[in-house]
Each structure stands twice: as C-alpha cells, then as structure tokens.
Amino acid sequence: SAASCPPISLPAAASRSSMDGAGAEEVLAPLRLAVRQQGDLVRKLKEDKAPQVDVDKAVAELKARKRVLEAKELALQPKDDIVDRAKMEDTLKRRFFYDQAFAIYGGVSGLYDFGPVGCALKNNIIQTWRQHFIQEEQILEIDCTMLTPEPVLKTSGHVDKFADFMVKDVKNGECFRADHLLKAHLQKLMSDKKCSVEKKSEMESVLAQLDNYGQQELADLFVNYNVKSPITGNDLSPPVSFNLMFKTFIGPGGNMPGYLRPETAQGIFLNFKRLLEFNQGKLPFAAAQIGNSFRNEISPRSGLIRVREFTMAEIEHFVDPSEKDHPKFQNVADLHLYLYSAKAQVSGQSARKMRLGDAVEQGVINNTVLGYFIGRIYLYLTKVGISPDKLRFRQHMENEMAHYACDCWDAESKTSYGWIEIVGCADRSCYDLSCHARATKVPLVAEKPLKEPKTVNVVQFEPSKGAIGKAYKKDAKLVMEYLAICDECYITEMEMLLNEKGEFTIETEGKTFQLTKDMINVKRFQKTLYVEEVVPNVIEPSFGLGRIMYTVFEHTFHVREGDEQRTFFSFPAVVAPFKCSVLPLSQNQEFMPFVKELSEALTRHGVSHKVDDSSGSIGRRYARTDEIGVAFGVTIDFDTVNKTPHTATLRDRDSMRQIRAEISELPSIVQDLANGNITWADVEARYPLFEGQETGKKETIEE
C-alpha cells in the first residue's frame, strides 16, 4: 500500500537554505528517485488494469512525493532569488497599490480594492493583453453577463464538480477547508518527537490520499485524529460539500436559481453560433472575454493569489479537430522556454529549457495550435514583467485534468508562495459545445465543404410517434428531441440493450423515460454529403490577471544596492502605472510654466505622468516615484530655465542614468520608450549623458 512509502528521509545537509548545484543534486537525487519509483507504480497499476481505487491511491502518493521534491528544490535555491515579501507588501499597501476591501468595516478576506497605482497597472496589463492577443490574432471580443442561470452551469459540469469539503467551528461558525485543515493538523502531529514510526507512517498514508477521500472518510479521519479549530480549539462540524460558486436567484420570484460565473468561458460557448455566423461560418476563429469571475473560496489565505472575485481574460480558439495546425507557429518556434512535461514530472526531473519547435516535433506538445498559444503566452508574460527564468509551462498529469480538458499546460511563475498557476492553456476538445448542444438541442457545429461528395452510412433512431405519444403524453416532444440528436455510438449501444433486454432508458432534463421495442427501432441507410458537420475543438488560454499582476510585483520588486530603505518596482514601461514623472528642481515660480507646458505635451502624446512639485529633495522625490514604479523622470532644473534651447534631464528608473534633451523632444521620446518602440540604450546613444548640474546652485540632481 502507499502507506509503506512515506517521502524519503533526507541527509542532514538538506536543511541548508541554499547550496551549490552538485550539493543540491545530491540531496534531490533520492527524492527524484522516489518520484520515479512511484511513477513506475502508477504506470504498472494502469497497465495491469488495477482497481481505480488502487490507482488513485498511488497517484495521490505520487503527487505527495512530487510536492516534497518541489518544496526541497525551492528550499535549495539561493535565498537572494526570493523576494522579501513583507517588505514588498508594505510598499504595496503603503502606496495604495491595493488594500483589503471594506477595510474600515474590518475587511473581508479574499476581496481586494485596487488603488490608483494598482488600478493603472492592472489597466495597462489588460490593455497590453488586448494588443498582444485580440489585435494580433483578430480575435472577436465579447462581453457577457456575470449572472448565469443554473442549467448552464449544470450542463457545463460546474454545479456537480466545482466543490470542496468544508468544516465549521461549532461555536463561532468559522469555516475551514477540510483537506487543508486535516493536512496541517497531521503535519503538526508528525513533527512531534513523541510520534511513533508506525503512527507517522499511518499519517503519511492519509496525507498521500488526501485528494481521494469522500465525505464520510474525511469525517472519520477528523474524529480519529481529534481535529479541532486551529484558532479557537473548538469542536468542528462534520465535513459538508461546499460548492465554490456564489448562488443567487434571478428575479424576485426566487424560482430561477443562478450563480455568479466561475469562469468567463461559458458565455463564449453559448454565443458560439452567433460568433461563427459573424465569422462567415468559417473555422478556425477565436473569441475572447475579459471580466470578473467569482469563486467562494472557503478560507482564502494567500493575499492576491487566492481571492473570491478576480479578473480573467479568456480566449476560446475554435478549430477543426482534423486541422490542429497553426499557420503562424513558425513565428514562435524558435523560442526557448522551460517546459515541465507530465513525463518529466513522473520521472522526478525538473522543467527543461526547450525550443518550442522541437517540443512540438518530439510530441511533448501535442499540436502547433497549442504550441503557438504557449509561445504567445510566454511572450506576453515576459513583456509585462515576468522573469523568463521564473516561468515554466507545466503539463497536467492525466489525473489532474479538469473535467473538461484532454490536455492542459499551465504557465506557472515562481514566487515566494512557490510555483503558482497564472495561465491555463487547455485543449478542451469538444467537451463544452457537445454538452451545451445536448442540453439545448441546438447543434453547435460548423459546416465544412467537402472536397468531393461522399457517401456515408447513417444510423438513426426511428421512433414510433404514436407509441411514444401514448406512453409519455406531453413529454413525448422531449423524448423525440433527445432521440433526434443521439450519436451513432450511443444508438448502437442502446440497440444492443433493446435486443438483449427489450428496453433501454434515457434521461433528459432531469426526467427518465423507458423505451421498449414497440416504441423505437434503429434505421440504417446511406446518404450523400456535400458538407460535413464539425464539432470544433477548443484551445483555451485562460489568464488570471490578478495572479499575473502579483507575479509582476514579485519579479520586479528590488531594493537599491547600498540602501535597504529604497525599494522600487522595475515594471516594464509598457505596463508602468505612470510612464514618467515631472519634477521641478525648485518650487520657484519660474519653473512652473515649463512644468505646465511639459505636462500638457505629455498628455497630448497620451503619456500618463505624475507631477511632483512637493518640497522634498530631488533624491527623495525620485525615491518616491521609483517606489510606485514610474518608468522615467523628467527634471526641470536651473539649466532648463536659464538656457536656450530649453532642455531638461530624462532619468531611467532602473539604471538611474540620465540624459539631457530639448523639452520639445521629451514627450515623443517617453512615448516611444513607453510603447517599446525604442529602448533606453537607444536613447543613451542619441543624447548626451547628464552627470551633474551645470548651474552653480546647491541643490543637484545627483542621488
């Protein structure tokens, strides 16, 4: 049993926070082996068609070992690789990038408000997304409602599958996610010196199978291990299934249950027919939506990483399943990025840097459509400030796949919370369109002209209207509609039942109907087709914009060398909340016309900027604008005022280097920098570097 194989105990050296590559590998080798060995077991069990419960147990243990390996890999990485989260969050809160929502009422966990800087950054991240995806790929953008009637989410599988188990503090009603709480409790018990080897082994076994327990098993475990509220020590209620969607009622009567959408995708699927028409009935095409989604997380803990309301940007790329080839794949084929295939995960390997073209050629990535999107996602994420070295694409293992996916790669970023998913890129096959077509009896298909007509064998149900009408009266229409859209596979299966048992049962719209030989038979005939119906496959890149934004915070947060107090965000200019600051060196009135003129010119050029004419020293004002990630700074100094042509200095936030240029040129220089048309190196090559004041005044721009 999996119980016999807890994660391998580590050599003492493993406790060090970082070490050289060879030393780290020595520590990781037994953990990698433990993962590989468990991977062998999972494969063997599947090969032997072992009972699913045994496979699930082994898979749970495999995941547990993978977690141990990953945690150790992270622990062994150099400490300077990890952001000082407390310091960063202090800056974010202090400068009102964001704050907890309803803070003056005590706040609500998992809900956040973005302040002016955070809001600007978020808008720029979204705007860059629109340019990078919607404009580049000519994607059809739509905007659907957040309120969704229950039948839609019943059909999509969310009502049944979108749930976690929850326990409640019996006295104060505080809720906890059952699996998280049990895990924390067992880990605490296991860390006790008095815990026997047998007990430890037993608990390891429980932890390994945590994802597989049902409601009753969890309830028993909570009793066996005497789990209490970690906060009050009070008793806990037995686990109950908790759907993560926010339920509501549409309209005053209370008879139309609905939910706040858990993803934006469903709106696109439901409008597929209209979108296909809009695209002149041709595949492939893509639709996108940016908007808020909602998940009623039981006890959100990790700041912006786990929230109850979050902005998503989702693309649904509809493609003919027989033509999963992207014409623009060559544009990204030469990108080198970290890929962490399912195969690598079960063999205890790390993510490996690979050329995208090779990954598709070698079958690591299934097709060029998926490959193209992975490449474009990579380019987008790095463009907005995510470090390529802290970004990987991890393939879901078979058992992790969402209920709708057949292949899935997550873009994951390395943060102080470990590796977190920031973009999912799923091949949803034809799951959603098929489900909604079945439920609504609306064929969600595209027609494809055949190169030459073909004769096909057709298998259909031939129902007896009279017999069905007699048996099911007003429900007969329901039955007939259902029978009209059944596929060949299903019809053949039912035909066997009809022949063996004389009847079969169908279920539609929550009702069950029994059909007997006198009500139905199966008709087979040939038909000539000039077009064929295609149920499109869907490739879905789904972006968690809040998580992307959080990653950008971590990957761009720095402390100035030699000055622990000076922190700054090195946001790429394209997403920086303000592209530049305008800083008059003195509050002297003669500086003001230049400030006004420059500010107006920047506005005309569409450059968001911030004027800081407060009385602090110039160094302190630079520090203040650096702290909110302002990309560039224009300083109006005494030379601006006293010399013609009027020039000012332009400072680069990251290098703190400055050039001098005419005021009239600065707006277009900053605009070009902000749009990514030129780099700071280009600017330095064209303009003289500025290193100190030329007018003999005490206050200088030097930092």
């Epitope: 049993s1 990698r32 080897v197």
Partner: antibody
Framework: EVQLLESGGGLVQPGGSLRLSCAAS????????MSWVRQAPGKGLEWVSA????????YYADSVKGRFTISRDNSKNTLYLQMNSLRAEDTAVYYC?????????WGQGTLVTVSS | QSVLTQPPSASGTPGQRVTISCTGS????????VNWYQQLPGTAPKLLIY???HRPSGVPDRFSGSKSGTSASLAISGLRSEDEADYYC???????????FGGGTKLTVL
C-alpha cells in the same frame, strides 16, 4: 510485447573486462529506469546497478562500485554494463530488468564466467 | 548474508496454503515497497507480487502479499505442483541507495 535481450557474456580472465548489452523493445525505453541483476551459479539474486531514464543518476551495489559502469543509449534502446577488473566472484548470469525496483520484465540472462 | 531474511525452504502438499516470510528494517521494507519474484528452475525470475500486495496481470489470485512494519509475507493458497520454484522478496533500501533481495526460499510441493 516487452522484450529484453542480453548479450556480451562469455569467459574472461580475472582482471579482464567485458561489456554487456541489453536490447529493449516493446515499450518506450527512454521513459524507464533500467537495472542489472545477477545470479551466481546455485545462489540467490543480487542487484548490481541501475540508471535513470536521462542518464542523470546511476546506482551501484557496494560489491561492484568503482569497477562496473552502467550506461544507456536511448536512441538505440540499449542498456550497457561495462565490467572492469573482473573477479572470480563476479561469475554469474547477468539479467537486465526494467525499473530500479519493480523488475516487472527480465531478460533471459547472459552468462559471465571469470576464470583463469 | 542477505539484507532481507527469508527461510531457505518451505513445503506443502497440493491444495494447502503456504506462507513465506521476509524480514528487513526501516530503511527497506519499513519505508519502501516490497516485491516478490518467482523463479522456476532454469528460467529468469518473474514478478509475482509488487508494491506489497498487487498482482501483475496473469498471476493467479492464489498468490497474495502483505506487509506489516518491517516484515512482509507471501501467501500461496491452493498449492499446485507448478508452484515449485524459488521465491525471492526484494525492496529498495534508502540507506544503501540500492535494491536488496532476500536469500530466496525454495518451495517444494510434496
């Protein structure tokens, strides 16, 4: 059908060298750890060495450390065991087997005799 | 001297149930999976039981494995003459970073 076929065994003098090969077929060779196990005449099984799929990790029994080298060529679906400084006690049938610990498939073995 | 200890021999009559034990330590059986192998005379070993108690496809359900602490056992019920063979237990040893076998048990069907 999974098949493992050892070759390269034979008679060798003490101190001599021999290279065993194991040709694999019927499965994705590059996905699996592979091992060598030996059995001296009339004796029990003894694990000798193992190697990870990417050649990154190699494991040896104390009795052969420093003398034997395991390697693989995934492009040829072949596992190797280079045996140097052979001793009389290395006389055995050498089997190659799949994985480091399951040994769910075995070859038919190749006999190595170390004798003067 | 093998790291895992097995009785050198065992016997039983057809139809009987026979058990073979295998004792080790926490670095092998205690914290790793146990496998059992059957070696018929003159042939290569064959995997009989893996990961303590799983049977590969094709192995009759008369063979079963179990484990408790640092010991494991193989049970054969409804003994048949074709079960006459050598049986080996084995497990990965985390301390040695290698695989260890028991000395083998010769099963005779009387």
């Amino acid at each position: 059908e999974v098949q493992l076929l050892e070759s390269g065994g034979g008679l060798v003098q003490p101190g001599g060298s021999l290279r065993l090969s194991c040709a694999a077929s019927g499965f994705t060779f590059s996905d699996y750890d592979m091992s060598w196990v030996r059995q001296a005449p009339g004796k029990g099984l003894e694990w000798v060495s193992a190697i990870s799929p990417d050649d990154g990790s190699k494991y040896y029994a104390d009795s052969v450390k420093g003398r034997f080298t395991i390697s693989r060529d995934n492009s040829k679906n072949t596992l190797y065991l280079q045996m140097n400084s052979l001793r009389a006690e290395d006389t055995a049938v050498y089997y190659c087997a799949r994985t480091t610990w399951l040994f769910d498939y075995w070859g038919q073995g190749t006999l190595v005799t170390v004798s003067s | 001297q093998s790291v895992l200890t097995q009785p050198p021999s065992a016997s039983g009559t057809p139809g009987q149930r026979v058990t073979i034990s295998c004792t080790g330590s926490s670095s092998n059986i205690g914290n790793n999976y146990v496998n059992w192998y059957q070696q018929l005379p003159g042939t290569a070993p064959k995997l009989l039981i893996y990961a303590d108690s799983h049977r590969p496809s094709g192995v009759p359900d008369r063979f079963s494995g179990s484990k408790s602490g640092t010991s494991a056992s193989l049970a054969i019920s409804g003994l048949r003459s074709e079960d006459e063979a050598d049986y080996y237990c084995g497990a990965w040893d985390s301390s040695l970073s290698g695989y260890v076998f028991g000395g083998g048990t010769k099963l005779t069907v009387l």
